[in-house]
């Protein structure tokens, strides 16, 4: 590229610093916070995105019943430790030496402990249930149109292989999107369902991670689909380990 083309950006991650100093003048981008190089042709891992976010200046039944082992991210934001591939480290600790184990989407799956806490492996989240409520519309969306549109969205915007979108359920005004991806199914280069779900969640909240002018503009047969509530449930390959005290609180 010529010097005139010195403005390069990362379409899939606005929380980056980029410059055309890669091989052949190709655009190279590094994530804020970690300084790790990211591949801008695909999604950035949730761990690196959370790290970048924490470093930024502060400012009837077709519906699925979440399993008893389903986790919801109640702890919110924290500054995570990521491994060299950008994945969450199994054990996370805060500045006061309080530690806990997380799953592959960074959600706590054990009680909090001290520095002696052991997290032997990063447990994979293999099933994600995204539960949405859309704003009132003149009539219900056509289920097959909605299904096709959401599958298209996850393929084209979030780069998620269609086989990982297991199902789309709809009972007006509730929409549920099921993502499934076992360790054995995920090939090199495949987007992780946890990363796709995180990008979708940020899009729905109007906090798009994508570069560009606007956020997500989702339409079904030309009719805008506006979401007013989102809940995400995470199911791990191994059930979480919480004490009975937490379960009865």
């Amino acid at each position: 590229h010529t010097a005139a083309q010195d403005n390069c950006t990362c379409p899939t991650n606005k929380m980056t610093v980029c410059s055309p100093d890669g091989p052949g003048g190709r655009c190279q981008c590094r994530a804020l916070g970690s300084g790790m190089a990211v591949d801008c042709s695909t999604l950035t891992s949730k761990c690196l995105l959370l790290k970048a976010r924490m470093s930024a200046p502060k400012n009837a039944r077709t519906l699925v019943r979440p399993s008893e082992h389903a986790l919801v991210d109640n702890d919110g934001l924290y500054d995570p430790d990521c491994d060299p591939e950008g994945r969450f480290k199994a054990r996370q600790c805060n500045q006061t030496s309080v530690c806990w184990c997380v799953n592959s989407v960074g959600v706590r799956r054990t009680d909090k402990g001290d520095l002696s806490l052991r997290c032997d492996e990063l447990v994979r989240t293999h099933h994600i249930l995204i539960d949405l409520r859309h704003r009132p519309t003149a009539g219900a969306f056509n289920h097959s149109d909605l299904d096709a549109e959401l599958r298209r969205l996850f393929r084209e915007r979030y780069r998620l292989h269609p086989k990982f979108v297991a199902a789309v359920h709809y009972e007006q005004p509730t929409i549920q999107i099921e993502l499934r991806q076992n360790t054995s199914q995920k090939a090199a280069g495949d987007v992780d369902i946890g990363d796709a779900a995180y990008y979708f969640e940020r899009d729905i909240k109007g906090e798009s991670l994508f570069q560009g002018r606007g956020g997500l503009d989702l339409r079904v047969r030309g009719e805008p689909l506006q979401v007013e509530r989102t809940l995400i449930y995470y199911l791990d390959e191994i059930p979480p380990k919480f004490s009975m005290k937490r379960l009865t609180a």
Epitope: A4, P11, G25, R152
Partner: nanobody, 126 residues
Framework: QVQLVESGGGLVQPGGSLRLSCAAS????????IGWIRQAPGKEREGVSC????????NYADSVKGRFTISRDNAKNTVYLQMNSLKPEDTGVYYC???????????????????WGQGTQVTVSS
Amino acid sequence: QVQLVESGGGLVQPGGSLRLSCAASRFTLDYYAIGWIRQAPGKEREGVSCISSSGGSTNYADSVKGRFTISRDNAKNTVYLQMNSLKPEDTGVYYCAATTYACSGYVPRAYEYDYWGQGTQVTVSS
């Protein structure tokens, strides 16, 4: 500021060919999928074709399949649309635009593009 500049439009007879070019200035197209969108007189903008950031995936609207070919040269920061066997209904303003969508299996809709050129007029008439 992202600037996309189209060229290559003009007046051509039915059955003829044109090659449109889309060049980016002060901006590298690396990682962006690029598409061509056209607007016929009195009609809404319609996605014609797109090419993925790597160039490995291309998609076309049914109305132009087999006649139009999209390609890109990332070293030259340029995308091309080769239009053959042109018909009067291909007349319109052709825009090039960049999108964060992948172009892996679909042509993005007009509202899914982020950065637009000013357009170049294509007229197919005898």
